[in-house]
């Protein structure tokens, strides 16, 4: 959570001379209360925007907009304090709009905007606009707060931002999963254009429980340049137990920009729906998961459909 670096912070508009200042989040009107204080903002609108820093990085920013109520209290409005709280870390950042001239009623509702709070992907923020001066201790509150959840790096708008690109958001591995004979699962994915290792993680669950019944990790060594954008294949030997059939596959890259904290892509292969016609007689504890058919699974179409629902984990 920070302010966009190089922009001149402007809040003046026709009919109002205004300056933006850094704030400690503790306006002195709390220490020296005033008798007459303005009412609260009428509406706050927050949306996501993308801005460039002076170093040319694209960063997600909050675009905050609010309007004033059309009452006489605007005659006592001396400014506003904008506060953004990042929920998970309790970090707070504030700026103050300081009005250098008195507000007057005009034909349109007064409207203010600010788009300089740089935020993180997949984080939740509380945005508060506090009109100044703040009210006396028992006075009616003159602030309004709204929450905003910044989308994760899967979101189209976020994908191109520098923090998301640094964690590998542009890489689409297009994972496919195929069940083979002899309790095997073949995972294929597209390599990115970097000579960096990958890890493929398989975790299997029973259909009815959340408990893992099998897991294994396979390493893929850093590809050579001529292998960039090619498909890589990994074959896993699965658990022998027929009930351990719900598979979760993750592909973890180790790109230089994010090391062991890169976005992972995952696919889930559900347990097959077993119909009476396809189930052979049980042998001991094991019912085959598939009928062999020239080296591919009866459920291959389902797997392929499933693989199109891949998603990021951060």
């Amino acid at each position: 959570l920070r302010l966009l670096d190089h922009r001149a912070l402007v809040c003046s508009q026709p009919g109002l001379n205004c300056t933006v200042k850094n704030s400690t989040c503790l306006d002195d009107s709390w220490i020296h209360p005033r008798n007459l204080t303005p009412s609260s903002p009428k509406n706050i609108y927050i949306n996501l925007s993308v801005s460039s820093t002076q170093h040319g990085e694209l960063v997600p920013v909050l675009h905050v907009e609010w309007t004033l109520q059309t009452d006489a209290s605007i005659l006592y409005l001396e400014g506003a304090e904008l506060s953004v709280l990042q929920l998970n870390t309790n970090e707070r950042l504030c700026v103050r709009f300081e009005f250098l001239s008195k507000l007057r009623h005009h034909h349109r509702r007064w409207r203010f905007t600010f788009s300089h709070f740089v935020v993180d992907p997949d984080q939740e923020y509380e945005v508060t606009v506090h009109h100044l001066p703040k009210p006396i201790p028992d006075g009616d509150p003159n602030h309004q707060s709204k929450n905003f959840l910044v989308p994760d790096c899967e979101h189209a708008r976020m994908k191109v931002t520098t923090p998301c690109m640094s964690s590998g958001s542009l890489w689409d591995p297009n994972i496919t999963v195929e069940t083979l004979e002899a309790h095997q699962l073949r995972v294929s994915f597209t390599l990115w254009n970097e000579s960096t290792p990958y890890q493929v993680l398989l975790e299997s669950f029973s259909d009815s429980e959340n408990h893992s019944c099998f897991d294994v990790v396979k390493q893929i060594f850093a590809p050579r340049q001529e292998e960039f954008h090619q498909r890589a294949n990994v074959t896993f030997t699965l658990s022998k137990f027929h009930w351990c059939c719900h598979h979760h596959v993750q592909v973890q890259p180790f790109f230089s920009s994010c090391l062991n904290d890169c976005l992972r892509h995952a696919v889930t292969v559900p347990c097959p729906v077993i119909s009476n016609t396809t189930v052979p007689k049980p042998v001991a504890d094991y019912i085959p998961l598939w009928e062999p058919r020239s080296g591919s699974s009866d459920y291959k179409d389902d797997d392929d459909k499933g693989s199109s629902h891949h998603h990021h984990h951060h």
């Epitope: 998970n88 602030h143 709204k146």
Partner: antibody, heavy 118, light 107 residues
């Protein structure tokens, strides 16, 4: 001195209600999100709920969703947890905890004990 | 929701030993991880936040490392007063789940 003091615990029958309070002092309460965390006897810590400084963001653990309500009164420097439809498994020590700037929870109360039993 | 696991669930070590506790998240959580120490009958105390930053007042024999899904708490030289249960907690997004805990005692 930064301090959190919980109160309102006690014994209640299954299906009953209790309201826990947490009184904060020694810091600007209205600047902080606040959490409730609980610990069943002999068990580990379980995060229960969080409320942001201006109450615009509230989250609950799945185990209490729809039964517990977190709230706060910044003018009174107080945090609350209204617990309805209590179950045996809600028996625990309930702590209020303040998040640290940067992450984690650095200030905890001493806890208040809730016993749900018929 | 992201699951947190800890290993071992308990351990016994001698005074002066190096002790390592691991915490694993079922999905990546960047460095949004905290470690706590809880002594019997007491409230938890924050040891480490942001995966590796030592909380003020915590002895330097405690250290944290890791990012993404795998994290480690290390006590470089175990002391008698370190007998406690240690919990990790993820705080990237709600719910802010704790790990099941690791009980540490002296041999």
């Amino acid at each position: 001195e930064v301090q959190l003091v919980e109160s309102g615990g006690g014994s209640v029958q299954p299906g009953g209600s209790l309201r826990l309070s947490c009184a904060a002092s020694g810091f600007t309460f209205s600047s902080y999100s606040m959490n409730w965390v609980r610990q069943a006897p002999g068990k580990g810590l379980e995060w229960v709920s969080i409320i942001s400084s201006r109450s615009s963001i509230i989250h609950y653990a799945d185990s209490v969703k729809g039964r517990f309500t977190i709230s706060r009164d910044n003018a009174k420097n107080s945090l609350y947890l209204q617990m309805n439809s209590l179950r045996d498994e809600d028996t625990a020590v309930y702590y209020c905890a303040r998040p640290k700037v940067g992450g984690g929870m650095d200030v905890w109360g001493q806890g208040t004990t809730v016993t749900v039993s018929s | 929701d992201i699951q947190m696991t800890q290993s071992p669930s308990s351990l016994s070590a001698s005074v002066g030993d190096r002790v390592t506790i691991t915490c694993r998240a079922s999905q990546g959580i960047s460095n949004y991880l905290a470690w706590y120490q809880q002594k019997p009958g007491k409230f938890p105390e924050l040891l480490i936040y942001a995966a590796s930053t030592l909380q003020s007042g915590v002895p330097s024999r405690f250290s944290g490392s890791g990012s993404g899904t795998d994290f480690t708490l290390t006590i470089s030289s175990l002391q008698p007063e370190d007998v406690a249960t240690y919990y990790c907690q993820k705080y990237n997004r709600a719910p802010f789940t704790f790990g099941p805990g690791t009980k540490v005692d002296i041999k």
